[in-house]
Structures are given as C-alpha cells and as structure tokens.
Amino acid sequence: AFGISGVQKYTRALHDSSITGISPITEYLASLSTYNDQSITFALEDESYEIYVEDLKKDEKKDKVLLSYYESQHPSNESGDGVDGKMLMVTLSPTKDFWLHANNKEHSVELHKCEKPLPDQAFFVLHNMHSNCVSFECKTDPGVFIGVKDNHLALIKVDSSENLCTENILFKLSET
C-alpha cells in the first residue's frame, strides 16, 4: 500500500493548517481499521488512488491517515436543536494533497487530490462510539456514514439511532 510512491513523511509542512479558513484543533496520524480489525489501505492504480478494506499479512505495515480535527458549530437544522452546540469534525488524508471525499451521488468514498480550502465533502463529523470505536458522518449529508461494503469503503445511510452501532460503520484508530 502506497509502496509505489514510497512511505510518506507526515509533518505539518505537508498539511498546512488553514482549511476553509479554520485551523485544525490538532492533528493525529493513525492507522484506520474496521470493527473486525481489517485494515483500510490505499493503493496507487492507473495514476489514481484506490481504497481497500483487507486483512494484512502478519508483519505487513499498516497505512496511516492524517486526521485533522476541527471544532464546528452544530447546525441547528441537522438536529432540530436551534442551539449552537459544538461538534468535532475531521478530514482524513492518507498522503500529501489527497483527502477522503464523500461522493453522495454514487454513495462512494473516494480519494481526491484537491487544493485548500477543502470542499465540504472532505469533512466528516466524528462520533465517539462504544468499544473504542469511532464513526464518520458526512458533513454534506447528515445520517450518512462512511462504512464497509464488499471490501470497499462506501457511504451508508443510517436511518435510526438504533443502527448507529451497526458494525459496518464502526472504525478503530490506532497509532500502531
């Protein structure tokens, strides 16, 4: 994974800190895996990156993703709040200048090369879930989460809060 382009060095220099005019609260370099401990990997194919969900061989190195955290007002129209609550949003970048994007029309998760400011499709509300898991909700499409479908990442509509704990939208973040 990313073997073609070589191992990326993650420094602040690679990810400047003004996205949509807001600086990240903090950044975190982590590997991303599913609830069932399959790894999320990224591979360069035909000059574009593909995202896979796969079991790694025993000593195979996990790909890393840079999570940039942002503080955001909770839009009252998303929850019926009418209150300025706060939530945490993230962008996810596995290599310089590439970010995970929600393609709501295709219900897919894609890696796009883009310039800053990043589009809203690159932002995800981070949910702190049970069992040391997180989930990623599309900023552009509330109720739609990054999930696993057929060994790929896809966008999955969660129709009720009872389904928020569905295993296929739960992910683990690890520094190793």
Epitope: L67, Y69, G82, V125, S161, C165
Partner: antibody, heavy 119, light 111 residues
Framework: EVQLVESGGGLVQPGGSLRLSCAAS????????MSWVRQAPGKGLEWVAT????????DYVDAVKGRFTISRDNSKNTLYLQMNSLRAEDTAVYYC????????????WGQGTLVTVSS | EIVLTQSPATLSLSPGERATLSCRAS??????????LNWFQQKPGQPPRLLIF???NRGSGVPARFSGSGSGTDFTLTISSLEPEDFAVYFC?????????FGQGTKVEIK
C-alpha cells in the same frame, strides 16, 4: 430552546426505590447520548450512568451497578433512572445531561432533582 | 479509574486579576490524538456549565477570557481577567474512558 427538566426526586427510606425522569425538548432526542450525574450536598460531581442515543449501550459507575438502571423512551423524549436498594450515600442532586453531537462531552445540563435517602 | 486532582482547593483573588487553575490526571487522558479533558463552572444553586472541551476549546457562548491548555496529564484553566460573575467553583472532567471522573473542584472566591 434546548431544555432538560428532571423530576421524581424526594425523600425515600434506605432500601427503597425511586424513578427519576428527565423530559427533553428543543432537540432531536434520539440523536444524543444522555447521562445522569449526581452531586452530594456540598460535594463534588459524580458521573452515574450513560445511555447511547439508540439505547444500545449503557454504562454505570461501580457504586450503582446492579441497583440503578438507566433507560430512555425516544418516542416520549424522556430519560429515566430507576434507583433501587437506595442507600444514604445516594443522597444527592441528580442532574440529567446531554452529550454534544458526536458524544465527546457533557454539553447541556438540567437544573437537577434532589434525592434524599434517610430514615 | 482515572483520578483527577485539582489545585488549589481555593483561590482568593480580586476582580480584574488573572486566575490559574490546575488539573492533574493520574494517567493520560489522550485518545485518538485528542486530550479529552473538559472544564465546567458551577455557581451556587445552579447546574454546571461547560466552559472548555478537549482541553482548549471554548463551549458555546463562553467568553474569550476563559482559556484552557495542557496535554497528557497536566491541564490548566486560565481566566485572564476575573469578572464578578466568574467567582464560582470550577471542575475538570475526563471523557476518555468510563467511569467518567471529575476533579474535586477549585473554588474561586473574592479576596
């Protein structure tokens, strides 16, 4: 306006039971994790229990495990705390709290309801 | 469980002065690269109010004179210039893991 209003507190004898309610309004109740936090008179704050928005997960502080049950009725926008086998040390103001969207911290608090356990 | 120790227990200051409150955790409260340490203000007869979340981020409607800092196990709440309404009890709280725990509180009183 977001509001949490607790009720059900009162005086109860040791070993007795009480059910607290928290009526929520002004937000989509089922989208948020809810908790109970208590404060003994003149003392600090103690987290008691949490329930996820979809009722799937519950967690309790050790001191109340097996005696207290947190539940919610999303159709009624109401959070509950069933308290059994009450002890003197359970005497406190009980606050209903709502997590922020995403469940990272206690963002909204009710005014609290006083539970007194005494013979 | 994670034990939070606040100091000092009481801080006696005058309006306009700077207040510095400390909270030390028995182990790191970092998770997913975030410091999951929050600060609350409580006035007599009132519920707590969120001031700071994730160590350094102000809650909604919290004045800019309140700021939080720190990481790992050591955290600070600073009130740059005390207003009369700031005299209250302040609690830190960790949301890294269950049981969620609070510090014992620091009372900021008028000197």
């Amino acid at each position: 306006e977001v509001q949490l209003v607790e009720s059900g507190g009162g005086l109860v004898q040791p070993g007795g039971s009480l059910r607290l309610s928290c009526a929520a309004s002004g937000f989509t109740f089922s989208s948020f994790s809810m908790s109970w936090v208590r404060q003994a008179p003149g003392k600090g704050l103690e987290w008691v229990a949490t329930i996820s928005g979809g009722k799937t997960f519950t967690d309790y502080v050790d001191a109340v495990k097996g005696r207290f049950t947190i539940s919610r009725d999303n159709s009624k926008n109401t959070l509950y705390l069933q308290m059994n086998s009450l002890r003197a040390e359970d005497t406190a103001v009980y606050y209903c709290t709502r997590a922020n969207y995403g469940n990272w911290f206690f963002e909204v608090w009710g005014q609290g309801t006083l539970v007194t356990v005494s013979s | 469980e994670i034990v939070l120790t606040q100091s000092p227990a009481t801080l006696s200051l005058s309006p306009g002065e700077r207040a510095t409150l400390s909270c030390r955790a028995s182990e790191s409260v970092a998770k997913y690269g975030l410091s999951l340490l929050n600060w609350f203000q409580q006035k007599p007869g009132q519920p707590p109010r969120l001031l700071i979340f994730a160590a350094s981020n102000r809650g909604s409607g919290v004045p800019a004179r309140f700021s939080g800092s720190g990481s790992g196990t050591d955290f600070t709440l600073t009130i740059s210039s005390l207003e009369p309404e700031d005299f209250a009890v302040y609690f830190c709280q960790q949301s890294k893991e269950v049981p969620f725990t609070f510090g014992q509180g620091t009372k900021v009183e008028i000197k």
